[in-house]
Protein backbone atom coordinates (compact mmCIF):
# COMPACT_ATOMS: atom_id res chain seq x y z
CA UNK A 1 0.00 0.00 0.00
CA UNK A 2 1.33 3.43 -0.96
CA UNK A 3 1.11 5.70 2.08
CA UNK A 4 3.59 8.39 1.05
CA UNK A 5 2.98 11.87 -0.29
CA UNK A 6 5.13 14.05 -2.52
CA UNK A 7 5.55 17.65 -1.49
CA UNK A 8 6.83 20.00 -4.20
CA UNK A 9 7.73 23.65 -4.61
CA UNK A 10 4.43 23.96 -6.47
CA UNK A 11 4.02 26.92 -8.83
CA UNK A 12 7.19 28.97 -9.02
CA UNK A 13 8.43 31.88 -11.06
CA UNK A 14 11.93 33.05 -11.85
CA UNK A 15 13.73 35.61 -13.99
CA UNK A 16 14.93 34.93 -17.50
CA UNK A 17 18.70 34.34 -17.32
CA UNK A 18 18.46 33.41 -13.66
CA UNK A 19 18.30 30.05 -11.95
CA UNK A 20 15.71 28.09 -10.02
CA UNK A 21 15.70 25.10 -7.69
CA UNK A 22 13.23 22.34 -8.44
CA UNK A 23 12.59 20.40 -5.27
CA UNK A 24 10.38 17.46 -4.30
CA UNK A 25 10.20 15.72 -0.97
CA UNK A 26 8.71 12.31 -0.23
CA UNK A 27 7.18 11.96 3.21
CA UNK A 28 4.90 9.66 5.25
CA UNK A 29 6.50 6.45 4.04
CA UNK A 30 9.34 4.22 5.16
CA UNK A 31 9.94 3.10 1.55
CA UNK A 32 13.49 3.18 0.26
CA UNK A 33 14.07 5.62 -2.61
CA UNK A 34 15.98 3.76 -5.33
CA UNK A 35 15.87 6.45 -8.02
CA UNK A 36 14.49 9.91 -8.75
CA UNK A 37 13.78 10.96 -12.34
CA UNK A 38 13.38 14.62 -13.31
CA UNK A 39 11.28 15.14 -16.41
CA UNK A 40 10.30 18.18 -18.46
CA UNK A 41 6.85 19.11 -19.79
CA UNK A 42 7.48 17.36 -23.13
CA UNK A 43 8.40 14.13 -21.28
CA UNK A 44 12.12 14.51 -21.97
CA UNK A 45 14.31 13.49 -19.05
CA UNK A 46 16.52 16.19 -17.55
CA UNK A 47 18.30 14.10 -14.98
CA UNK A 48 18.28 10.89 -12.98
CA UNK A 49 19.54 10.38 -9.47
CA UNK A 50 20.06 6.71 -8.64
CA UNK A 51 20.59 5.96 -4.96
CA UNK A 52 23.58 3.74 -5.68
CA UNK A 53 24.87 4.99 -9.02
CA UNK A 54 24.59 8.73 -8.43
CA UNK A 55 23.53 11.48 -10.84
CA UNK A 56 23.20 11.45 -14.59
CA UNK A 57 22.40 14.72 -16.36
CA UNK A 58 21.17 14.21 -19.90
CA UNK A 59 23.52 15.64 -22.55
CA UNK A 60 21.01 18.17 -23.87
CA UNK A 61 20.86 19.78 -20.41
CA UNK A 62 24.47 19.32 -19.22
CA UNK A 63 25.33 23.02 -19.49
CA UNK A 64 22.22 24.29 -17.71
CA UNK A 65 21.30 21.70 -15.10
CA UNK A 66 23.14 21.12 -11.85
CA UNK A 67 22.36 18.24 -9.50
CA UNK A 68 21.01 19.08 -6.07
CA UNK A 69 20.48 20.31 -3.51
CA UNK A 70 19.67 16.84 -2.21
CA UNK A 71 17.43 15.01 -4.65
CA UNK A 72 16.42 18.31 -6.24
CA UNK A 73 17.66 19.98 -9.39
CA UNK A 74 18.98 23.44 -10.16
CA UNK A 75 18.02 24.83 -13.55
CA UNK A 76 20.31 27.64 -14.70
CA UNK A 77 20.43 30.29 -17.46
CA UNK A 78 16.65 30.20 -17.75
CA UNK A 79 14.98 31.00 -21.05
CA UNK A 80 11.32 31.67 -21.83
CA UNK A 81 11.15 28.16 -23.32
CA UNK A 82 11.76 26.70 -19.86
CA UNK A 83 8.25 27.77 -18.81
CA UNK A 84 6.08 24.73 -18.20
CA UNK A 85 5.59 21.65 -16.08
CA UNK A 86 8.35 19.65 -14.44
CA UNK A 87 7.86 16.27 -12.84
CA UNK A 88 9.80 14.36 -10.22
CA UNK A 89 9.26 10.61 -10.17
CA UNK A 90 10.35 8.80 -7.04
CA UNK A 91 11.00 5.11 -7.60
CA UNK A 92 10.71 3.40 -4.23
CA UNK A 93 10.92 -0.06 -2.74
CA UNK A 94 8.51 -1.59 -1.92
CA UNK A 95 5.87 1.10 -2.56
CA UNK A 96 6.40 1.71 -6.28
CA UNK A 97 6.45 5.11 -7.99
CA UNK A 98 5.36 8.50 -6.66
CA UNK A 99 5.10 11.55 -8.89
CA UNK A 100 5.16 15.26 -8.12
CA UNK A 101 4.47 18.25 -10.36
CA UNK A 102 6.02 21.72 -10.41
CA UNK A 103 4.98 24.54 -12.70
CA UNK A 104 7.73 27.00 -13.59
CA UNK A 105 7.00 30.37 -15.12
CA UNK A 106 9.99 32.24 -16.54
CA UNK A 107 9.38 35.99 -16.58
CA UNK A 108 11.02 38.78 -18.54
CA UNK A 109 10.28 41.14 -15.71
CA UNK A 110 12.96 41.99 -13.18
CA UNK A 111 10.35 41.70 -10.46
CA UNK A 112 9.95 37.95 -10.96
CA UNK A 113 9.74 36.29 -7.60
CA UNK A 114 11.17 32.89 -6.90
CA UNK A 115 8.66 31.40 -4.44
CA UNK A 116 9.86 28.24 -2.78
CA UNK A 117 7.01 27.16 -0.57
CA UNK A 118 6.28 23.45 -0.55
CA UNK A 119 2.93 22.22 -1.78
CA UNK A 120 1.23 18.85 -1.83
CA UNK A 121 -0.16 18.36 -5.34
Amino acid sequence: MMTGTIETTGNISAKKGGSVILQCHLSSTMAQVTQVNWEQHDHSLLAIRNAELGWHIYPAFKDRVAPGPGLGLTLQSLTMNDTGEYFCTYHTYPDGTYRGRIFLEVLESSVAEHSARFQIP
Epitope: H43, L45, N50, G54, H91
Partner: antibody
Framework: QVQLVQSGAEVKKPGASVKVSCKAS????????MHWVRQAPGQGLEWMGV????????SYAQKFQGRVTLTRDTSTSTVYMELSSLRSEDTAVYYC??????????????WGQGTTVTVSS | EIVLTQSPGTLSLSPGERATLSCRAS???????LAWYQQKPGQAPRLLIY???SRATGIPDRFSGSGSGTDFTLTISRLEPEDFAVYYC?????????FGGGTKVEIK
Protein backbone atom coordinates in the same frame (compact mmCIF):
# COMPACT_ATOMS: atom_id res chain seq x y z
CA GLN B 1 33.54 -4.61 -33.43
CA VAL B 2 32.25 -4.59 -29.85
CA GLN B 3 32.71 -7.99 -28.25
CA LEU B 4 32.19 -9.47 -24.80
CA VAL B 5 33.84 -12.84 -24.18
CA GLN B 6 32.93 -14.72 -21.02
CA SER B 7 34.77 -17.42 -19.10
CA GLY B 8 33.91 -21.10 -19.43
CA ALA B 9 31.30 -23.28 -17.75
CA GLU B 10 31.56 -23.95 -14.02
CA VAL B 11 30.29 -26.74 -11.78
CA LYS B 12 30.04 -25.84 -8.10
CA LYS B 13 28.83 -27.42 -4.87
CA PRO B 14 26.07 -25.81 -2.77
CA GLY B 15 27.50 -23.19 -0.42
CA ALA B 16 30.48 -22.45 -2.66
CA SER B 17 31.17 -19.28 -4.66
CA VAL B 18 31.66 -18.75 -8.37
CA LYS B 19 33.44 -15.95 -10.21
CA VAL B 20 32.58 -15.36 -13.86
CA SER B 21 34.64 -13.04 -16.06
CA CYS B 22 33.63 -10.95 -19.05
CA LYS B 23 36.39 -9.51 -21.25
CA ALA B 24 35.44 -6.52 -23.37
CA SER B 25 36.99 -5.33 -26.63
CA UNK B 26 36.20 -3.01 -29.54
CA UNK B 27 35.15 0.03 -27.48
CA UNK B 28 36.34 2.36 -24.74
CA UNK B 29 35.95 0.14 -21.69
CA UNK B 30 35.94 3.04 -19.23
CA UNK B 31 32.94 4.72 -20.88
CA UNK B 32 30.18 2.18 -20.32
CA UNK B 33 28.24 0.47 -17.56
CA MET B 34 28.03 -3.33 -17.59
CA HIS B 35 24.98 -5.33 -16.53
CA TRP B 36 24.69 -8.94 -15.45
CA VAL B 37 21.61 -10.99 -16.28
CA ARG B 38 20.91 -14.65 -15.60
CA GLN B 39 18.63 -17.25 -17.14
CA ALA B 40 17.68 -20.46 -15.37
CA PRO B 41 17.09 -23.52 -17.59
CA GLY B 42 13.91 -23.04 -19.63
CA GLN B 43 13.17 -19.77 -17.85
CA GLY B 44 13.18 -16.06 -18.63
CA LEU B 45 15.79 -13.35 -18.06
CA GLU B 46 16.56 -11.87 -14.64
CA TRP B 47 18.58 -8.69 -14.08
CA MET B 48 21.14 -9.08 -11.29
CA GLY B 49 23.07 -5.84 -11.16
CA VAL B 50 25.16 -3.21 -12.92
CA UNK B 51 28.66 -1.79 -12.42
CA UNK B 52 29.90 1.66 -13.42
CA UNK B 53 32.74 2.47 -15.82
CA UNK B 54 35.29 3.04 -13.07
CA UNK B 55 34.02 0.25 -10.84
CA UNK B 56 33.27 2.73 -8.08
CA UNK B 57 29.51 2.43 -8.40
CA UNK B 58 27.37 -0.70 -8.37
CA SER B 59 23.68 -1.42 -8.04
CA TYR B 60 22.19 -4.82 -7.32
CA ALA B 61 18.70 -6.27 -7.54
CA GLN B 62 17.24 -6.70 -4.05
CA LYS B 63 17.13 -10.47 -4.53
CA PHE B 64 20.91 -10.71 -4.94
CA GLN B 65 21.97 -8.03 -2.46
CA GLY B 66 24.69 -9.37 -0.18
CA ARG B 67 25.36 -12.42 -2.35
CA VAL B 68 26.61 -10.89 -5.58
CA THR B 69 29.70 -8.72 -6.08
CA LEU B 70 30.56 -6.96 -9.32
CA THR B 71 34.10 -5.73 -9.92
CA ARG B 72 36.12 -4.58 -12.92
CA ASP B 73 39.78 -4.51 -13.91
CA THR B 74 40.51 -1.60 -16.23
CA SER B 75 43.98 -2.88 -17.10
CA THR B 76 42.52 -6.00 -18.73
CA SER B 77 39.11 -4.55 -19.75
CA THR B 78 37.43 -7.29 -17.73
CA VAL B 79 34.35 -7.28 -15.52
CA TYR B 80 33.75 -9.96 -12.89
CA MET B 81 30.61 -11.28 -11.26
CA GLU B 82 31.01 -13.27 -8.06
CA LEU B 83 28.03 -15.09 -6.56
CA SER B 84 28.41 -16.63 -3.11
CA SER B 85 26.46 -19.12 -0.98
CA LEU B 86 25.40 -20.98 -4.09
CA ARG B 87 22.27 -23.11 -4.09
CA SER B 88 20.71 -25.36 -6.71
CA GLU B 89 18.36 -22.54 -7.82
CA ASP B 90 21.44 -20.59 -8.96
CA THR B 91 21.98 -23.10 -11.78
CA ALA B 92 21.68 -20.85 -14.82
CA VAL B 93 23.40 -19.20 -17.74
CA TYR B 94 24.96 -15.91 -16.64
CA TYR B 95 25.35 -13.09 -19.17
CA CYS B 96 27.24 -9.83 -19.09
CA UNK B 97 25.70 -7.09 -21.24
CA UNK B 98 27.08 -3.65 -22.06
CA UNK B 99 24.79 -0.70 -21.65
CA UNK B 100 23.65 1.23 -24.71
CA UNK B 101 24.46 4.65 -23.23
CA UNK B 102 27.21 6.36 -21.28
CA UNK B 103 25.21 5.86 -18.08
CA UNK B 104 23.03 3.10 -16.63
CA UNK B 105 20.20 3.48 -19.14
CA UNK B 106 19.18 -0.14 -18.62
CA UNK B 107 19.20 -0.86 -22.37
CA UNK B 108 21.41 -3.91 -22.83
CA UNK B 109 22.93 -3.44 -26.26
CA UNK B 110 25.76 -5.97 -26.55
CA TRP B 111 25.75 -9.36 -24.81
CA GLY B 112 28.41 -11.89 -23.92
CA GLN B 113 27.94 -15.49 -25.08
CA GLY B 114 26.91 -16.61 -21.58
CA THR B 115 28.51 -18.79 -18.92
CA THR B 116 26.74 -21.89 -17.64
CA VAL B 117 26.98 -22.33 -13.88
CA THR B 118 25.74 -25.64 -12.49
CA VAL B 119 25.25 -26.02 -8.75
CA SER B 120 25.06 -29.65 -7.74
CA SER B 121 26.10 -31.77 -4.78
CA GLU C 1 9.00 -3.67 -9.00
CA ILE C 2 7.30 -3.40 -12.37
CA VAL C 3 5.94 -6.73 -13.56
CA LEU C 4 5.77 -7.30 -17.32
CA THR C 5 3.28 -9.83 -18.69
CA GLN C 6 3.77 -11.07 -22.24
CA SER C 7 1.11 -12.67 -24.40
CA PRO C 8 0.59 -15.03 -25.97
CA GLY C 9 3.04 -17.49 -24.44
CA THR C 10 3.45 -19.19 -27.81
CA LEU C 11 2.61 -17.97 -31.29
CA SER C 12 2.43 -20.55 -34.11
CA LEU C 13 2.81 -18.93 -37.51
CA SER C 14 4.11 -19.63 -40.99
CA PRO C 15 6.93 -17.76 -42.76
CA GLY C 16 5.58 -14.66 -44.50
CA GLU C 17 2.86 -14.12 -41.90
CA ARG C 18 2.59 -11.14 -39.55
CA ALA C 19 3.42 -11.62 -35.86
CA THR C 20 1.99 -9.39 -33.14
CA LEU C 21 3.43 -9.77 -29.64
CA SER C 22 2.06 -8.01 -26.59
CA CYS C 23 3.71 -6.78 -23.39
CA ARG C 24 1.69 -5.30 -20.52
CA ALA C 25 3.25 -3.49 -17.55
CA SER C 26 1.84 -3.56 -14.01
CA UNK C 27 2.34 0.21 -13.83
CA UNK C 28 3.04 2.96 -16.33
CA UNK C 29 6.40 2.87 -18.07
CA UNK C 30 6.73 6.58 -18.70
CA UNK C 31 8.49 7.99 -21.73
CA UNK C 32 8.25 4.56 -23.37
CA UNK C 33 11.20 3.12 -21.48
CA LEU C 34 10.71 -0.31 -22.97
CA ALA C 35 12.99 -2.60 -24.98
CA TRP C 36 12.51 -5.83 -26.93
CA TYR C 37 15.05 -8.65 -27.29
CA GLN C 38 15.21 -11.74 -29.48
CA GLN C 39 16.75 -14.98 -28.24
CA LYS C 40 17.42 -18.09 -30.29
CA PRO C 41 18.15 -21.49 -28.66
CA GLY C 42 21.66 -21.65 -27.23
CA GLN C 43 22.35 -17.99 -27.99
CA ALA C 44 22.49 -14.76 -26.01
CA PRO C 45 19.62 -12.28 -26.31
CA ARG C 46 19.90 -9.60 -29.01
CA LEU C 47 18.56 -6.07 -28.67
CA LEU C 48 15.88 -5.32 -31.27
CA ILE C 49 13.97 -2.24 -30.09
CA TYR C 50 14.46 0.41 -27.40
CA UNK C 51 12.40 3.45 -26.46
CA UNK C 52 9.37 1.32 -27.43
CA UNK C 53 9.83 2.04 -31.14
CA SER C 54 13.50 2.75 -32.04
CA ARG C 55 15.25 -0.07 -33.89
CA ALA C 56 18.71 -1.04 -32.65
CA THR C 57 21.65 -0.94 -35.05
CA GLY C 58 21.40 -3.54 -37.83
CA ILE C 59 17.82 -4.58 -37.08
CA PRO C 60 15.73 -5.02 -40.26
CA ASP C 61 12.71 -2.78 -40.71
CA ARG C 62 10.26 -5.68 -40.62
CA PHE C 63 10.59 -5.35 -36.83
CA SER C 64 8.64 -2.48 -35.32
CA GLY C 65 7.61 -1.51 -31.82
CA SER C 66 4.75 0.63 -30.59
CA GLY C 67 2.81 1.53 -27.46
CA SER C 68 3.09 3.67 -24.37
CA GLY C 69 2.10 3.64 -20.73
CA THR C 70 1.27 0.05 -19.86
CA ASP C 71 0.62 -1.55 -23.26
CA PHE C 72 3.36 -2.26 -25.79
CA THR C 73 3.51 -4.27 -29.01
CA LEU C 74 6.26 -5.80 -31.11
CA THR C 75 5.25 -6.46 -34.71
CA ILE C 76 7.15 -8.55 -37.25
CA SER C 77 5.55 -7.61 -40.57
CA ARG C 78 6.60 -10.70 -42.56
CA LEU C 79 8.19 -13.58 -40.71
CA GLU C 80 11.48 -14.83 -42.11
CA PRO C 81 12.79 -18.31 -41.19
CA GLU C 82 15.42 -16.72 -38.91
CA ASP C 83 12.75 -14.85 -36.90
CA PHE C 84 11.46 -17.96 -35.14
CA ALA C 85 12.74 -17.44 -31.60
CA VAL C 86 11.73 -16.25 -28.13
CA TYR C 87 11.05 -12.53 -27.67
CA TYR C 88 11.36 -10.69 -24.36
CA CYS C 89 10.22 -7.20 -23.40
CA UNK C 90 12.11 -5.27 -20.72
CA UNK C 91 11.40 -2.05 -18.84
CA UNK C 92 14.19 0.30 -17.86
CA UNK C 93 12.05 3.02 -16.32
CA UNK C 94 12.04 1.91 -12.71
CA UNK C 95 14.82 -0.02 -10.99
CA UNK C 96 15.17 -2.97 -10.71
CA UNK C 97 15.02 -3.42 -14.48
CA UNK C 98 12.68 -6.30 -15.27
CA PHE C 99 11.88 -8.61 -18.18
CA GLY C 100 8.66 -10.20 -19.32
CA GLY C 101 8.29 -13.98 -19.34
CA GLY C 102 8.78 -14.19 -23.10
CA THR C 103 6.77 -15.14 -26.18
CA LYS C 104 7.91 -18.05 -28.30
CA VAL C 105 7.30 -17.62 -32.02
CA GLU C 106 7.34 -21.08 -33.56
CA ILE C 107 6.82 -22.45 -37.05
CA LYS C 108 3.29 -23.66 -37.66
Amino acid sequence: QVQLVQSGAEVKKPGASVKVSCKASGYTFTSYYMHWVRQAPGQGLEWMGVIGPSGASTSYAQKFQGRVTLTRDTSTSTVYMELSSLRSEDTAVYYCARDHSDYWSGIMEVWGQGTTVTVSS
Amino acid sequence: EIVLTQSPGTLSLSPGERATLSCRASQSVRSSYLAWYQQKPGQAPRLLIYGASSRATGIPDRFSGSGSGTDFTLTISRLEPEDFAVYYCQQYFSPPWTFGGGTKVEIK
